[in-house]
Amino acid sequence: APTSSSTKKTQLQLEHLLLDLQMILNGINNYKNPKLTRMLTFKFYMPKKATELKHLQCLEEELKPLEEVLNLAQSKNFHLRPRDLISNINVIVLELKGSETTFMCEYADETATIVEFLNRWITFCQSIISTLT
């Protein structure tokens, strides 16, 4: 059974992940056209189901394309370079989902824009945090 300290650690990690994802989304929303227009033509894969920490596997698999898209934007809207930002997210995701169990991610048929993708994972974080508090 999870201890109160491990629950607290999970909550803090999720909050950190949530802030990172929100920072990316805010940065994207500050883009001028045609950068945003171009960005929105990139498609991301969405999880069929995202209700447990193990489902973060689906986010992990999309971090490389996410980094590429952020690199293309060459934005000054982020305090960190995309590589560092995504690296930070990757570390948190790996810790949260754990490496003991191998989970095969199932993706939805429909792809999503970067904005829809980020909003989906922001909602996921908020949902899990609410169950922990």
Epitope: R38, M39, T41
Partner: antibody, heavy 121, light 108 residues
Framework: QVQLVESGGGLVKPGRSLRLSCAAS????????MSWVRQAPGKGLEWVAM????????YYTDSVSGRFTISRDNSKTTLFLQMDSLRTEDTAVYYC??????????????WGQGTLVTVSS | DIQMTQSPSSLSASIGDRVTIPCQAS??????LSWYQQKPGKAPKPLIF???DLETGVPSRFSGSGSGTDFALTISSLRPDDFATYYC??????????FGHGTKLEIK
């Protein structure tokens, strides 16, 4: 790093066919629109064809429409250009190029080294 | 299709000169314009996109300006490596992308 390597060029007679390939590496190929751009000897650049990230949309310049077909195999990270009913005016170096977008509204940010297609009897 | 006019077709300049290469679109293309540098026997190299944004790794002596129909590529202080042919390219009239015919920058 991003690499685009073209192959399949050569000498071909008018009316014949040729298939160009472009092996892509160093990026998530299945997220990017790809194009072919050509350059006739001593001439300028001409965009030939473009394909969206998933192959769902293809676009062509008028002079090749109906004769050329652009396609991609995302599992093999390879772009193709099937060229049928070739004409002497199709003689050019053909470049495989990446666009920093999933579809349209995009310039070309990475270019292959090119492959020469010569159409002559 | 939108026509891209690059005039002159060739330009002579000396090392250290400030050079401006113009490009004109036949209709408004907003800032959907890019610039490429090409050397003989080589693939074009991207320099500028969205009219004024510098590609990663391109020296800051290169700059792009303009919007609508009139654009320019400026090299603030010519280096020996800059002698090449420069092409402008519009990606506004999707999907009918068109290039200018190029301006060859030669040593005076």
């Amino acid at each position: 790093q991003v690499q685009l390597v073209e192959s399949g060029g050569g000498l071909v007679k008018p009316g014949r066919s040729l298939r160009l390939s472009c092996a892509a590496s160093g990026f998530t190929f299945n997220r990017y629109a790809m194009s072919w751009v050509r350059q006739a000897p001593g001439k300028g650049l001409e965009w030939v064809a473009m394909i969206s990230f998933d192959g769902g949309n293809q676009y062509y310049t008028d002079s090749v429409s109906g004769r050329f077909t652009i396609s991609r195999d995302n599992s093999k990270t390879t772009l193709f250009l099937q060229m049928d009913s070739l004409r002497t005016e199709d003689t050019a170096v053909y470049y495989c190029v990446r666009s920093p977008a999933g579809d349209w509204v995009a310039y070309f940010d990475y270019w292959g080294q090119g492959t020469l297609v010569t159409v002559s009897s | 299709d939108i026509q891209m006019t690059q005039s002159p077709s060739s330009l002579s300049a000396s090392i250290g000169d400030r050079v401006t290469i113009p490009c004109q679109a036949s209709e408004d293309i907003s800032n959907h314009l890019s610039w490429y540098q090409q050397k003989p026997g080589k693939a074009p190299k991207p320099l500028i996109f969205d009219a004024s944004d510098l590609e990663t790794g391109v020296p800051s002596r290169f700059s792009g300006s303009g919007s609508g129909t009139d654009f320019a590529l400026t090299i603030s202080s010519l280096r020996p490596d800059d002698f090449a042919t420069y092409y402008c390219h519009q990606y506004h009239d999707y999907p009918s992308y068109t290039f200018g015919h190029g301006t060859k920058l030669e040593i005076k």
